[in-house]
Interface confidence: low
């Protein structure tokens, strides 16, 4: 019984994790250790986003009763899409010399770009196991949003009557999380 105890572990982040995501969703802080962004020179508690970042996340998945046997690794997209000149490692360089002012950058969000599906096994306290099919993020991008777009932090597609699977990301505050569905 590998996981003696669990609900959900949080996920880690890379260096200073932004204090608030660019979308209006608020995520649990990431988890188990949490990494920070590399060399941004920003304090982890800074209120300033440093751009659309791919944060490596490591977390356990739980549906309330059962927990994944080992941590799940994925990317979490976080940050604002700020003007090119202030983003040394900006994701979305394909936009070339396109320059967004700070004002218009508020219409752009750092969101999931590429994903992949994988199965994970959850171990339950009674010794049984459950299998979930989840979608994990593998790349992020800046995307233009109109006002009516208001995505929630977590999109769960749990087919079971149990509580929705929860991510615990304690490593960072990021936006958009994996989708989970019972398989």
């Amino acid at each position: 019984f590998k996981n003696d105890a669990t609900e959900i572990l949080y996920s880690h982040v890379v260096k200073p994790v932004p204090a608030h995501p660019s979308s209006n969703s608020t995520l649990n802080q990431a988890r188990n250790g949490g990494r920070h962004f590399s060399n941004t020179g920003l304090d982890r508690n800074t209120r300033v986003q440093v751009g659309c970042r791919e944060l490596r996340s490591t977390k356990y998945i739980s549906d309330g009763q059962c927990t994944s046997i080992s941590p799940l690794k994925e990317l979490v997209c976080a940050g604002e899409c700020l003007p090119l000149p202030v983003l040394p490692n900006w994701i979305g360089g394909g936009y070339g010399t396109k320059y967004w002012s700070r004002r218009s950058s508020q219409e752009w969000r750092c969101v999931n770009d590429k994903t992949r599906t994988q199965r994970i096994q959850l171990q339950c306290q009674d010794g049984s196991t459950r299998t979930y099919k989840i979608t994990v993020v593998t790349a992020c991008k800046c995307k233009r949003y109109t006002r009516q777009h208001n995505e929630s932090s977590h999109n769960f597609e749990s087919m079971s009557p149990a509580k929705p699977v929860q991510h615990h990301r304690e490593r960072k505050r990021a936006s958009k999380s994996s989708k989970h569905s019972m398989s």
Epitope: D4, A5, E7, R31, R44, Q166, E170, K172, R173
Partner: antibody, heavy 118, light 107 residues
Framework: QVQLVQSGAEVKKPGSSVKVSCKAS????????ISWVRQAPGQGLEWMGW????????RYNRKFTGRVTITADESTSTAYMELSSLRSEDTAVYYC???????????WGQGTLVTVSS | DIQMTQSPSSLSASIGDRVTITCQAS??????LNWYQQKQGKAPKVLIF???NLAAGVPSRFSGSGSGTDFTLTISSLQPEDIATYYC?????????FGQGTKVDNK
Amino acid sequence: QVQLVQSGAEVKKPGSSVKVSCKASGGTFSSTYISWVRQAPGQGLEWMGWIYAGTGGTRYNRKFTGRVTITADESTSTAYMELSSLRSEDTAVYYCAREGVDGWFTYWGQGTLVTVSS
Amino acid sequence: DIQMTQSPSSLSASIGDRVTITCQASQDINNYLNWYQQKQGKAPKVLIFDASNLAAGVPSRFSGSGSGTDFTLTISSLQPEDIATYYCQQYDNLPLTFGQGTKVDNK
């Protein structure tokens, strides 16, 4: 600024129960994990279990299963840890700890000393 | 349960010394390891997360390294305020477990 404030010291008799509280301020209580960690005098740290405040979901260290109950009251942003069938070896400082960017135990309460003595 | 073994259990060092504490896990825990500092009568404080990342507000003289089963906490130049007990903690699997601690005092 996240802060965890615990209830005061307790002296208990063997076989009785103790319930320690941990009031959280700052941050979002409902979307966080609160763990309980204990430390016997002169000893190391021992994780007892946690609660995810938003759902009330708990997980316990097998060592304490059946004796420990962790609960949370969202309306007061308070987590509780109740330990039953107390014995002298349960004499320890009990800490609540909240997850944060740096791990499961980023923010700590000040600790509550529970003394079990006849 | 994953056992975490720290060594040494205690050490004496002079101010300015380089101090190294090791932590060994009973099985591979990737880099799912944190280091904490605990001063007498106080709650622990996180120093390093994910084995090698410095927590907010922690002086740069502290560093962590390692992956798998063997990990190290290094204090490059011991300061008077570093006199404390240090714990490693794994979160690769539940239950979350700590090392037994390494007490660092002044020579």
